[in-house]
């Protein structure tokens, strides 16, 4: 059966049951994911907006899939195996009475079972297994996965140590607060900012101090390290990633099949062998590609380069250049240009630099 082909998996709680406090729902679902992350290399992250891999839904009766719920009792919940769209999603019958304890139906225990399905597990014939098809309350404080559950999930994803080998010394994780730190590429992805460097990326959730480092391969196993440019078209849930003369398309955080493709499909002349940086401006619906000391402008609607390009970066972006490492768009009016360990906030309406920062200023260094 299907499995997630990555180790970094997002979930979102679409709506909350009125049976429980929101915090209790959040906690039950978080702990249920933790049960599975404790025994695998998988990492789960809750997002509040955008398209998650696993959507948690409370619904009654018909709710948008083929499998309408049946009122109180009977079917408590169901979940779809890994995949795009509805794949991975877990639905809980709102006609049940969801609880944190032994009365009603315990949300944590049910969620552990359903998340098992979301990760690709089928039912177990072992009555002690959480993946046994019928619900039975057990003390949640002493709850443990059975040997059968662990065998099943590890046959799909391996054990937790498998993705935690130390990186090579010559390609070790860069120190985030090193004042000389530079980035290869930076882009927004919904409400997050991805900072790429070598084999790694840092994830910064807007307006939150916490940052996490991840291997690119843990999120996108089919992508190379050393991403050189990246941009997002948020309205389409698309991210484009560039390395050398190739690019990859990521939709809803999932790599699209039939990639990589040649950057020359955008209309670059043959002498362009790689992209240094790229940024999409949704106001103009144009993408700016920066190559050495020049830039091109691409019309995303018409899917072609605008005439009159390339132009010199220094001529049209006052104070920027001659070359840049990375750039992203934010707050509807700024480009953030990265040059080595320096970063420039550039107001594209005023057409000037409004702030000079260190490249790692986003991380509270």
């Amino acid at each position: 059966g299907p499995v997630w082909r990555k180790h970094y998996i997002t979930y979102r709680i679409n709506n909350y049951t009125p049976d429980m406090n929101r915090e209790d729902v959040d906690y039950a679902i978080r702990k249920a994911f933790q049960v599975w992350s404790n025994v695998t290399p998988l990492k789960f992250s809750k997002i509040n907006t955008g398209m998650a891999d696993i959507l948690v839904v409370f619904a009654r009766g018909a709710h948008g899939d083929f499998h309408a719920f049946d009122g109180k009792g009977g079917i408590l919940a169901h979940a779809f195996g890994p995949g795009s769209g509805i794949g991975g999603d877990a639905h809980f019958d709102e006609d049940e009475f969801w609880t944190t304890h032994s009365g009603g139906t315990n949300l944590f225990l049910t969620a552990v079972h359903e998340i098992g399905h979301s990760l690709g597990l089928g039912h177990s014939s072992d009555p002690k297994a959480v993946m046994f098809p019928t619900y039975k309350y057990v003390d949640i404080n002493t709850f443990r996965l059975s040997a059968d559950d662990i065998r099943g999930i590890q046959s799909l994803y391996g054990d937790p140590k498998e993705n935690q080998r130390l990186p090579n010394p010559d390609n070790s994780e860069p120190a985030l607060c090193d004042p000389n730190l530079s980035f290869d590429a930076v882009t927004t992805v919904g409400n997050k900012i991805f900072f790429f460097k070598d084999r790694f990326f840092w994830l910064k959730v807007s307006e939150r101090p916490k940052t996490s480092v991840n291997l690119i391969s843990s999120l996108w196993p089919t992508l190379p390290s050393g991403i050189e440019a990246a941009y997002e078209i948020e309205a389409r849930n698309q991210v484009f990633l560039f390395k050398d003369d190739k690019y990859w398309l990521i939709s809803n955080l999932r790599p699209e099949p039939n990639y990589p493709k040649s950057i020359h499909s955008f209309g670059f002349p043959n002498f362009v062998k790689k992209i240094d940086a790229a940024v999409f401006n949704p106001r103009f619906y144009r993408t700016y590609f920066f190559v050495d000391n020049q830039y091109w402008r691409y019309d995303e609607r018409r899917q072609m380069m605008d005439p009159g390009y390339p132009k010199l970066i220094t001529k049209n972006f006052q104070g920027i250049g001659p070359k840049i490492d990375a750039v992203f768009y934010s707050k509807n009016k700024y480009y953030y240009f990265f040059q080595g360990s320096n970063q420039f906030e550039y107001d594209f309406l005023l057409q000037r630099i409004t702030k000079t920062l260190k490249s790692n200023s986003w991380f509270g260094c």
Partner: antibody, heavy 122, light 103 residues
């Protein structure tokens, strides 16, 4: 390459029976949900029936419940639709369509056959 | 049962136009909505799944948006090959279709 090829359509009298087949290739047949969707001449699409990869779960539209039976033979990579007590309003092109892998159907039809025409008329 | 209402039922437009088709569900279907294109005498083709995800091989001028009860399919710049009938769908329910014709 994923391919679905329907056969078995034709002219049948009201009250009669017909069995449609859909031969599949290019994917692991027993993993996938499969469905029948029909389209009356000049009209829109109407979902008819679906079956899980193992054949253990089946679903029907109210308009065909009790008259049509969906089944599959995973050893032959073939999907079937047995249609009994046919009515004039069952006249349509019948398409088979592939859904996702897994215990439940997403109703996400990513590959379709070309269709086979069933005409119910006296 | 959930009902799907698609509008308009027909639409005339010219090459290069931006076109929007809407689909409304009678109750929330989250993002469980798909869009298909069908040309005369041909089988339907999946364009967009899960409300906004572009099916592999579909040109990027097609985009989808929406969640809950209201959804849209947008073609940013109509091409000659886009004139066809478009259907929204969730589970076993299809919208009644929108026929897109050349003006």
């Amino acid at each position: 390459e994923v391919q679905l090829l329907e056969s078995g359509g034709g002219l049948v009298q009201p009250g009669g029976s017909l069995r449609l087949s859909c031969a599949a290739s290019g994917f692991t047949f027993s993993d996938y949900w499969l469905h029948w969707v029909r389209q009356a001449p000049g009209k829109g699409l109407e979902w008819v029936s679906g079956i899980s990869g193992s054949g253990g779960m089946t679903m029907y539209a109210d308009s065909v419940k009790g008259r049509f039976t969906i089944s599959r033979d995973n050893s032959k990579n073939t999907l079937y639709l047995q249609m009994n007590s046919l009515r004039a309003e069952d006249t349509a092109v019948y398409y088979c369509a592939r859904d996702i892998v897994g215990p439940y159907s997403a109703g996400l039809f990513d590959y379709w056959g070309r269709g086979t025409l069933v005409t119910v008329s006296s | 049962d959930i009902q799907m209402t698609q509008s308009p039922s027909s639409l005339s437009a010219s090459v290069g136009d931006r076109v929007t088709i809407t689909c409304r569900a009678s109750q929330s279907i989250y993002t469980y909505l798909n869009w298909y294109q069908q040309k005369p005498g041909k089988a339907p083709k999946l364009l967009i799944y899960a409300a906004s995800s572009l099916q592999s091989g579909v040109p990027s001028r097609f985009s989808g948006s929406g969640s809950g009860t209201d959804f849209t399919l947008t073609i940013s710049s109509l091409q000659p090959e886009d004139f066809a009938t478009y259907y929204c769908q969730q589970a076993g329910i299809f919208g009644q279709g929108t026929k897109l014709e050349i003006k």
